[in-house]
């Protein structure tokens, strides 16, 4: 029970975390205009990794695209780039975490693959987690240098007569989105890894020790009382007494011909 | 067609208070910045104030803003300028204007107009 | 404050003239997030509210007719009527758009010879 709570919240987490990440790539303000200690203009400019916009006190806005690719910053580049790997990661582990998920069958999967699918989602979760957060630690640390470089600018600008209103960028709302959803994308991954341990099958095989007892030839496994007959011929939702304190999300089970997804 | 039409100007005394309205008509009146501006009896034009479309922003002339309140009635389709602690140099024509793009006033109203004298 | 000044306080002309005015401000009206100065030109008539011509320093009001320009960036701009008809006759004032508290030029008078 504990492994699919665990699985299912992991997938939860990181299907919000994606769901952010991709908002915040798609957000226009990823830099918003430094209102603090500036002149007040009546307009306001915020930046995105796709275009810029300008918001007139009039309530009028205008968004202009970055129509080129060649003419922009590298870094901005960069930061696009691990946006975009962080959601292609993102949406891949989601539909390999769907066709994981413990509470949904397909066919006759059986619990190795569905572990294995979880490993596979929760990795691609932390990578796209990894990607989000960097990109937008770069985009952050683009604006702390470009901040101090125009307030530098801005102090030693005065001796001319002309002033200029310069305008300094700072932290946008996109930026935090991106910090947090990254970071639940990153949970949300941990949280798969962590339930596909308790998904995978125990790969320990005890050999069975034979007791020749007048009668019948039984083998008996140690920690049970369970009489074993070869393989697992246990049905689907048979209760069956286990000496250990195995969950029964642990006790391999078999599709029937009345499974369906 | 759009239309400002003001009212409330009149003869007051210094250091009386005024309320003058600006009615609007023939546009969404809540989509819109709106402002303020005087002409002095030299024909200077002064800007007194604006407002956003939602109201909650106001900027004000440093030489009025303690004496002169911006404020708009969504419902009323109106907008106001409260001045009080009036002097004889706030004696003008107050026109209210529609901030369109570029923050430019693209319609303008007839003026309504404010006498301050003893 | 920005302080707008406008030159030449009046000006006689004949017409059919070519005439230009001018604006200067003491702060740069041009905004860097989208390259646009945030100049306004107005025309006053006598007994008539103010009439927005040109804002944007260089983009005309629908209905304006295509005989007033505006250009300029930075500081310094300019309106320029190509040809002066009879009923250009009236004042023209600049204002900063951009950063508050807005302010206004004191006008160019533009009277006919």
């Known amino acids: 029970m504990a492994v699919t709570a665990c699985q299912g919240l992991g997938f939860v987490v990181s299907l919000i975390g994606i769901a952010g990440i991709i908002a915040a790539t798609c957000m226009d303000q990823w830099s918003t205009q430094d209102l603090y200690n500036n002149p007040v203009t009546a307009v306001f400019n915020y930046q995105g990794l796709w275009r810029s916009c300008v918001r007139e006190s009039s309530g009028f806005t205008e968004c202009r695209g970055y129509f080129t690719l060649l003419g922009l910053p590298a870094m901005l580049q960069a930061v696009r780039a691990l946006m975009i790997v962080g959601i292609v990661l993102g949406a891949i582990g989601l539909l390999v975490s769907i066709f994981a998920l413990k509470c949904i069958r397909i066919g006759s999967m059986e619990d190795s693959a569905k572990a294995n699918m979880t490993l596979t989602s929760g990795i691609m979760f932390i990578v796209s987690g990894l990607c989000a957060i960097a990109g937008v630690s770069v985009f952050a640390n683009m604006l702390v240098t470009n901040f101090w470089m125009s307030t530098a600018n801005m102090y030693t600008g005065m001796g001319g007569m002309v002033q200029t209103v310069q305008t300094r960028y700072t932290f946008g709302a996109a930026l935090f989105v991106g910090w947090v959803a990254g970071g639940l994308t990153l949970i949300g991954g941990v949280m798969m890894c962590i339930a596909c341990r308790g998904l995978a099958p125990e790969e320990t095989n005890y050999k069975a020790v034979s007791y020749h007892a007048s009668g019948h030839s039984v083998a008996y496994k140690p920690g049970g009382f369970k009489a074993s007959t070869g393989f697992g011929s246990n049905t689907k939702n048979k209760k069956i007494y286990d000496g250990g304190a195995r969950t029964e999300d642990e006790v391999q089970s078999y599709p029937s011909k009345h499974d369906y997804v | 067609q759009v239309q400002l039409k003001e009212s409330g100007g009149g003869l007051v005394k210094p250091g009386g208070s005024l309320k003058l309205s600006c009615a609007a008509s023939?546009?969404?009146?809540?989509?819109?910045?709106m402002s303020w501006v005087r002409q002095t009896p030299e024909k200077r034009l002064e800007w007194v104030a604006a407002?956003?479309?939602?109201?909650?922003?106001?900027y004000n002339s440093d030489t009025m803003r303690d004496r002169f309140t911006i404020s708009r009635d969504h419902a009323k389709n109106t907008l106001y300028l409260q001045m009080s602690s009036l002097r004889s140099e706030d004696t003008a024509l107050y026109y209210c204007?529609?901030?369109?793009?570029?923050?430019?006033?693209?319609?303008w109203g007839q003026g309504t107009s404010v006498t301050v004298s003893s | 404050d920005i302080q707008m000044t406008q030159s030449p306080s009046s000006l006689t002309v004949t017409a059919g003239e070519k005439v230009t005015l001018t604006c200067k401000s003491s702060?740069?009206?041009?905004?860097?997030?989208?390259?646009?100065?945030?100049l306004t030109w107005y025309q006053q008539k006598p007994g008539q509210p103010p009439k927005l011509l040109i804002y944007?320093?260089?983009t005309r009001e629908s209905g304006v007719p295509d005989r007033f320009t505006g250009s300029g960036s930075g500081t310094f701009f300019t309106l320029t009527i190509s040809s002066v008809q009879a009923e250009d006759l009236a004042v023209y004032f600049c204002?900063?758009?951009?950063?508050?508290?807005?302010?206004f030029g004191a006008g160019t008078q533009l009277e006919l010879k």
């Open positions: 204007g529609r901030q369109s793009f570029g923050n430019a006033l693209d319609y």
């Open positions: 023939g546009f969404t009146f809540s989509s819109y910045a």
């Open positions: 407002i956003h479309s939602n109201g909650g922003s106001t």
């Open positions: 702060q740069s009206l041009l905004n860097s997030g989208n390259q646009k100065n945030y």
């Open positions: 944007w320093a260089s």
């Open positions: 204002q900063n758009d951009y950063v508050y508290p807005f302010t």
